[in-house]
């Protein structure tokens, strides 16, 4: 089941998830002058690897067909090194089943990622330079289907200007600690939602049939 | 597939200065942090400093601050590590990263900091001697 709408954002903060769950697709988008090779349309996480590699080239007509069939071929070998090109694991991220790791920059992508996420996705969030954070809980956000339909929990996080830091945390201990508030009822009112509804901006699922096909 | 390059590594008197670069032909910058590790003998690799190819925030480890400058040039798809003052401490070999940014273009230090980057490059040997 892929995730409606994008996790959402916490202010002075910013999230990426760590690994990707299996079923994950990234379109392959490319940057102004570039484009897609027909085929690779998108990357599909499947069990701890990525289903094929985003390739884009140059929108200028003048690049031969051979170029683009040398491409192809190369497609295979550039799985192999994709995997050489992490010397190093950090503790919390070895390769767990099921998961993805970030792919690797291709070149002439697009600055933006697209991603859709499939339920049990995990994104983590951090405080961006020159705020701390103020946690309540943990700072991650969860795709999770509840009452038919999924969305993102809210993140526990509160990331303030760190020269106000100790005022914040002055006030915090005179007024106690304040629980985060807990997971509400399984019973699914008609009215009601558990999730933070999405901004105006935010991606729907809509988009994803529409950005897949070639353009 | 795309590759990081290093170059300007080299054997230098202390209080000495070397200019690193980091070559990364196709990369687009703007979706990315890009910078420096090192990694010294028997020690573990480090997180130097960063530059963010959306809006060039920038990070630096305390025992660099004021001697190191990082800087880029998005045209070139080159990103370069100005070392100053250079102490014995500083021999290690440098290796450029690039990592992924988060949401809204933005990235954290603690991302730098755990060391798990998208691509990494070969090194470059910097010996400082005294």
């Known amino acids: 089941e892929l995730c409606l709408y994008d996790p959402p954002e916490v202010p002075n903060a910013t999230f990426k998830a760590l690994s990707y769950k299996n079923g994950t697709i990234l379109n392959c988008e490319c940057k102004r002058g570039f484009r897609r090779l027909k085929e690779l349309v998108y990357m599909r996480c499947l069990g701890n690897s990525w289903s094929s590699n985003c390739q884009c080239t140059s929108n200028s007509h003048d690049k031969s067909r051979k170029q683009v069939t040398a491409q192809l071929e190369h497609q295979k070998e550039q799985q192999t090194t994709t995997d050489m090109q992490k010397p190093t694991q950090s503790m919390h991220q070895e390769n767990l089943t099921g998961h993805c790791r970030e792919p690797p920059p291709w070149k002439h992508e697009d600055s933006k990622r697209i991603y859709h996420f499939v339920e049990g996705q995990s994104v983590h969030y951090e405080c961006i330079p020159g705020y701390k954070a103020l946690q309540r809980g943990p700072a991650i956000s969860i795709c999770k289907m509840k009452c038919g339909k999924t969305g993102w929990t809210q993140p526990q996080l509160t990331c303030v200007d760190e020269r106000e830091h100790h005022r914040f945390l002055a006030s915090e201990e005179s007024q106690g600690s304040r629980n985060s508030s807990p997971e509400s009822e399984t019973s699914c009112p008609i009215t009601t939602t558990d999730f933070p509804q999405p901004t105006e901006t935010t991606a729907m699922t809509e988009t994803f049939v529409l950005t897949m096909e070639y353009k | 597939q795309l590759q990081l390059v290093e170059s300007g590594g080299g054997l230098v008197q202390a209080g000495g200065s070397l200019r690193l670069s980091c070559a990364a032909s196709?990369?687009?910058?703007?979706?990315?942090?890009i910078g420096w590790f090192r990694q010294a003998p028997g020690k573990e690799r480090e997180g130097v400093s960063y530059i963010t190819g959306s809006d060039g925030t920038t990070y630096y480890i305390n025992s660099v601050k004021g001697r190191f400058t990082i800087s880029s040039d998005n045209a070139k798809s080159t990103v370069y590590l100005q070392m100053n003052t250079l102490k014995p401490e500083d021999t290690a070999v440098y290796y450029c990263?690039?990592?992924?940014?988060?949401?809204?273009?933005?990235?954290?230090?603690?991302?730098?900091?755990?060391?798990?980057?998208?691509?990494w490059g070969k090194g470059t040997q910097v010996t400082v001697s005294s």
């Open positions: 196709g990369l687009t910058f703007e979706g990315y942090a």
């Open positions: 990263a690039v990592d992924r940014l988060g949401s809204q273009g933005r990235y954290a230090s603690a991302w730098w900091r755990s060391g798990d980057m998208d691509l």
